[in-house]
């Protein structure tokens, strides 16, 4: 039974407008036609759902109106957007993929992409 | 290095239950998922059901109703309570953890049901 090996980048650093962006690669051992993403937050060994999308192949990712994520796929790629991020979201964002459809089911989780948030500094008063 | 060591197979009637265990052992990641496949012969491997560390469940649609699987994270062991068990069900069943970047099998337990 073939394993799936799925790949993020280790490390990324959010924009001071608080977007993080990273690519979930995944090596698919079957023809999957339904994949479904999700991207879990490690912190202090606690983990939760940041967000998850089921999608078909060829078709964009859709996720919830109210999510957090947007994403993009092509082929066996999925460029994901993480936006809304503040200091406190620092940590470890893991990537998860399974293919759902068709038969056999496989799942796949990368190594997790460390996402640096730095809160802006605000803007100093000005004296004209 | 992590190894997987599976218990609980055996032979049971139809209607029976049996219960499967399997530990894990070495260093694992805090985030990881456990599970169970099995194999009936001539047929591929497929899944039955997975749990993952932050408690998400997922069960195939022939394990709905009559299976449970539940985990505890302490001990890094995953169980498969199995009810109502048919002849269908026998198979070879094996576990499977998934951590950060890799998984891992279990060797095997037969379980066959069979009057």
């Known amino acids: 039974c073939k394993a799936m090996h799925v790949a993020q980048p280790a490390v990324v650093l959010a924009s001071s407008r608080g977007i993080a962006s990273f690519v979930c690669e995944y090596a698919s051992p079957g023809k999957a036609t339904e994949v479904r993403v999700t991207v879990l937050r490690q912190a202090d060994s606690q983990v939760t759902e940041v967000c998850a999308a089921t999608y078909m192949m060829g078709n964009e990712l859709t996720f919830l109106d109210d999510s957090i994520c947007t994403g993009t796929s092509s082929g066996n790629q999925v460029n994901l957007t993480i936006q809304g991020l503040r200091a406190m979201d620092t940590g470890l964002y893991i990537c998860k993929v399974e293919l759902m459809y068709p038969p056999p089911y496989y799942l796949g989780i990368g190594n997790g992409t460390q996402i640096y948030v730095i809160d802006p500094e605000p803007c100093p008063d000005s004296d004209f | 290095e992590v190894q997987l060591v599976e218990s609980g197979g055996g032979l049971v009637e139809p209607g029976g239950s049996l219960r499967l265990s399997c530990a894990a052992s070495?260093?694992?990641?805090?985030?990881?998922?456990m599970g169970w496949y099995r194999q009936a012969p001539g047929q591929q491997r497929d899944l039955v059901a997975h749990?993952?560390?932050?408690?998400?469940?997922m069960y195939a649609d022939s394990a709905k109703g009559r299976f449970t699987i539940s985990r505890d994270n302490a001990k890094k062991t995953v169980y498969l309570q199995m009810n109502s068990l048919k002849p269908e069900d026998t198979a070879v069943y094996y576990c499977?953890?998934?951590?950060?970047?890799?998984?891992?099998w279990g060797q095997r337990t037969q379980v066959t049901v069979s009057s």
């Open positions: 070495g260093s694992i990641s805090s985030y990881n998922v």
């Open positions: 499977k953890l998934w951590v950060l970047g890799n998984d891992y």
């Open positions: 749990i993952a560390s932050n408690g998400e469940i």
